[in-house]
Interface confidence: medium
């Protein structure tokens, strides 16, 4: 599923991401935009043999199990395919674990490069939340 901007903002708010660990909803919508272009089925392969999955491009080396990433830790204890569902519950729950891990949203390269220090509130402007 490819979410609309406000549609995703509403879904993320429903799942408790607004101000989760101090990150406003705009940060999460911005991250999703530049990680996956709001596409729940996005997959991207990395040079280390791991793959990033879903709307928040969660990595198989650490967070989920795709059955083929050597040394996968699967810290979210889920199959990576669950992160590709049109229901973002699994991605959000795993993202909460990631953002609580110490580096905050710096874990997402796209957030660090494209969202951090910008007017992220623009990503939820005009949305009825």
């Amino acid at each position: 599923k490819v979410f609309g901007r406000c549609e995703l903002a509403a879904a993320m708010k429903r799942h408790g991401l607004d101000n989760y660990r101090g990150y406003s909803l705009g940060n999460w919508v911005c991250a999703a935009k530049f990680e996956s272009n709001f596409n729940t089925q996005a997959t991207n392969r990395n040079t280390d043999g791991s793959t990033d999955y879903g709307i928040l491009q969660i990595n198989s080396r650490w967070w989920c199990n795709d059955g083929r990433t050597p040394g996968s830790r699967n810290l979210c204890n889920i199959p990576c395919s669950a992160l590709l569902s049109s229901d973002i519950t699994a991605s959000v729950n795993c993202a909460k674990k990631i953002v609580s891990d110490g580096n905050g949203m710096n874990a997402w390269v796209a957030w660090r490069n494209r969202c951090k220090g910008t007017d992220v509130q623009a990503w939820i402007r005009g949305c009825r939340l």
Partner: antibody, heavy 115, light 107 residues
Framework: QVQLQESGAEVMKPGASVKISCKAT????????IEWVKQRPGHGLEWIGE????????YYNEKFKGKATFTADTSSNTAYMQLSSLTSEDSAVYYC?????????WGQGTTLTVS | DIELTQSPATLSVTPGDSVSLSCRAS??????LHWYQQKPHESPRLLIK???QSMSGIPSRFSGSGSGTDFTLSINSVETEDFGMYFC?????????FGGGTKLEIK
């Protein structure tokens, strides 16, 4: 137990297209990548590409882009590979395998003859 | 693409001999290398994964070693059922690639 059952041998004319199937049983089909591999005598094994049935995400070896197209039907737990514009170079045995990095589970192979 | 070079192309041995098959990668692939055996008209069978991890059900005479660019499959005291083709495959990066194979034949 995990099994991958491929469709039977095919004899096709040059220029035609063919669709090979791979039915998976014994595991959660949507969770694992299905890989496709080509084997020609004297050419060893070549990785064609892969599909994740749960999402339809696909990756192709550059060499096979435009030649192979992967699809999957999650209702029947079946992956498909279509090969188009067939030439004698496409005559080979085609395998599906479950993509665990390594390939422990393989189909029995589908022999394609283009003649 | 990562190229895998297997040597020798053919190995003629007598049952009871011990042999080593080589697989060399064009760049470092850590331990992300796997070994397969293939008999005529059969699908490949995974023997060793990630350089040295033996698969269950595979006889203990098969062992793997190596890391980086140089890998070895060893067969301690070859039996008649071991004859066939042996392939290596890397899963360090895409596209996945295979070696050209080593044919193990009876002398």
């Amino acid at each position: 137990q995990v099994q991958l059952q491929e469709s039977g041998a095919e004899v096709m004319k040059p220029g035609a297209s063919v669709k090979i199937s791979c039915k998976a049983t014994g595991y959660t089909f949507t969770t694992y990548w299905i890989e496709w591999v080509k084997q020609r005598p004297g050419h060893g094994l070549e990785w064609i590409g892969e599909i994740l049935p749960g999402s339809g995400s696909t990756y192709y070896n550059e060499k096979f882009k435009g030649k192979a197209t992967f699809t999957a039907d999650t209702s029947s737990n079946t992956a498909y590979m279509q090969l188009s514009s067939l030439t004698s170079e496409d005559s080979a045995v085609y395998y599906c395998a479950r993509g665990d990095g390594n390939y422990y589970y393989w189909g029995q192979g589908t022999t394609l003859t283009v003649s | 693409d990562i190229e895998l070079t297997q040597s020798p192309a053919t190995l003629s041995v007598t049952p009871g001999d011990s042999v080593s098959l080589s697989c060399r990668a064009s760049q470092s692939i850590s331990n992300n290398l796997h070994w397969y055996q293939q008999k005529p008209h059969e699908s490949p069978r995974l023997l060793i994964k990630y350089g040295s991890q033996s698969m269950s059900g595979i006889p203990s005479r098969f062992s793997g070693s190596g890391s980086g660019t140089d890998f070895t499959l060893s067969i301690n005291s070859v039996e008649t059922e071991d004859f066939g083709m042996y392939f290596c495959q890397q899963s360090n990066s895409w596209p996945r690639t295979f070696g050209g194979g080593t044919k193990l034949e009876i002398k």
